[in-house]
């Protein structure tokens, strides 16, 4: 029999680890898409929404050629930690209107935490430094109104979806370069 469940493997194939991270990211992307669609159905968005406290997009067509694994994993982990904080804030301060989405938001938070653990494991296996965020953490105050929390939810889910979408593409690309 192999090592007990949950024990770290002695040696590891980085491509297999990256594969596993891609699968988790894809799965979270699908969950986020579903929840964002649910949000749009329950609370139709009037135009676009943004939040100053959300991370700026790290990837685009222009950055794909110069992607490197350490930078991508570090930035992705920092950005996802920010989104995790925003999801936690939504669940805590979102108000009664968002309580109807509580089971889904809770599941999303759990999957986000799982992906973050996987990224941390991957970074430690690749002997990459576990960098702390270089931007100061902006404290998240309570939403100004019930409508404010709905707008924030649209912005958070939309931003997370976009970040994960690019993350899948970036990780797939990096896998071919390992």
């Amino acid at each position: 029999p192999g090592p007990p469940a949950g024990s770290p493997r002695v040696s590891s194939d980085p491509r297999a680890d990256l594969d596993s991270a891609v699968l988790l990211t894809r799965s979270l992307l699908a969950d986020t898409r579903q929840l964002a669609a649910q949000m749009r159905d329950k609370f139709p968005a009037d135009g676009d929404h943004s939040l100053d406290s959300l991370p700026t997009l790290a990837m685009s067509a222009g950055t794909l050629g110069s992607l490197q694994l350490p930078g991508v994993l570090t930035r992705l982990r920092v950005d996802l930690m920010s989104y995790l904080r925003h999801v936690q804030w939504l669940r805590r301060a979102g108000g009664p209107s968002l309580k109807t989405l509580e089971p889904e938001l809770g599941a999303l938070q759990a999957r986000l935490e799982r992906l973050l653990r996987r990224l941390q494991l991957l970074m430690s296996r690749l002997a990459l430094p576990q960098a702390a965020p270089d931007q100061p953490v902006i404290p998240l105050g309570p939403p100004a109104s019930a409508w404010g929390s709905i707008r924030a939810a649209h912005a958070i889910l939309g931003g997370l979806h976009l970040t994960l979408d690019w993350a899948v593409r970036g990780l797939l690309l990096l896998k071919t370069r390992l």
Epitope: G47, A61, T63, D165, T176
Partner: antibody, heavy 117, light 110 residues
Framework: EVQLLESGGGLVQPGGSLRLSCAAS????????MNWLRQAPGKGLEWVGV????????FYADFVKGRFTISRDNSKNTLYLQMNSLRAEDTAVYYC??????????WGQGTLVTVSS | QSVLTQPPSASGTPGQRVTISCSGS????????VNWYQQLPGTAPKLLIY???LLPSGVPDRFSGSKSGTSASLAISGLRSEDEADYYC???????????FGGGTKLTVL
Amino acid sequence: EVQLLESGGGLVQPGGSLRLSCAASGFTFSHYDMNWLRQAPGKGLEWVGVISYEGSNKFYADFVKGRFTISRDNSKNTLYLQMNSLRAEDTAVYYCARTPGSHFDYWGQGTLVTVSS
Amino acid sequence: QSVLTQPPSASGTPGQRVTISCSGSSSNIGNNAVNWYQQLPGTAPKLLIYYDDLLPSGVPDRFSGSKSGTSASLAISGLRSEDEADYYCSAWDDSLNAVVFGGGTKLTVL
């Protein structure tokens, strides 16, 4: 609701120029890479090029390099395609499309460009 | 000549399951995500499948995608008359540094 609306198509002579526009609404335009694609009458889809969300990076298909230029104005939520030295084989419906990664998740309705003398 | 290869046509009767194939190489399908688009007659294309097998919101789960090696396929179960359309596969090509498409498959519901 995400909407993309192309305009500027029409009839132009070979060797002539045309500028297409794509007005975007319903999303944060400055967060998304944007593409132009085309479809010749009765033919398949063909990718023309992409511009990164902030506008500083552009990539083109080989058949348009040096002739077509993609640009964007994020303050106006508008994407552009400047087409020069047009040829008969550039006759097609031109679509703008949004990219959140590797795919085109929203497309405009298209604008027809006819290159003929 | 398209970089990705699709059969020009496919057909089926209502309720049937049909599959459309798309073959490429290691520089496109082998190393990159495959996306599928549906183009109904006289309309713009619409995203049907992304990242090999994910469905955008609003697309019925009768549609599914899969990928193996340098080939991909789109399956439509419980075929309906409104599925009659052109279907295109697409992927990024590392060698060409471009998005490439299949030539399209015209699906007829008999």
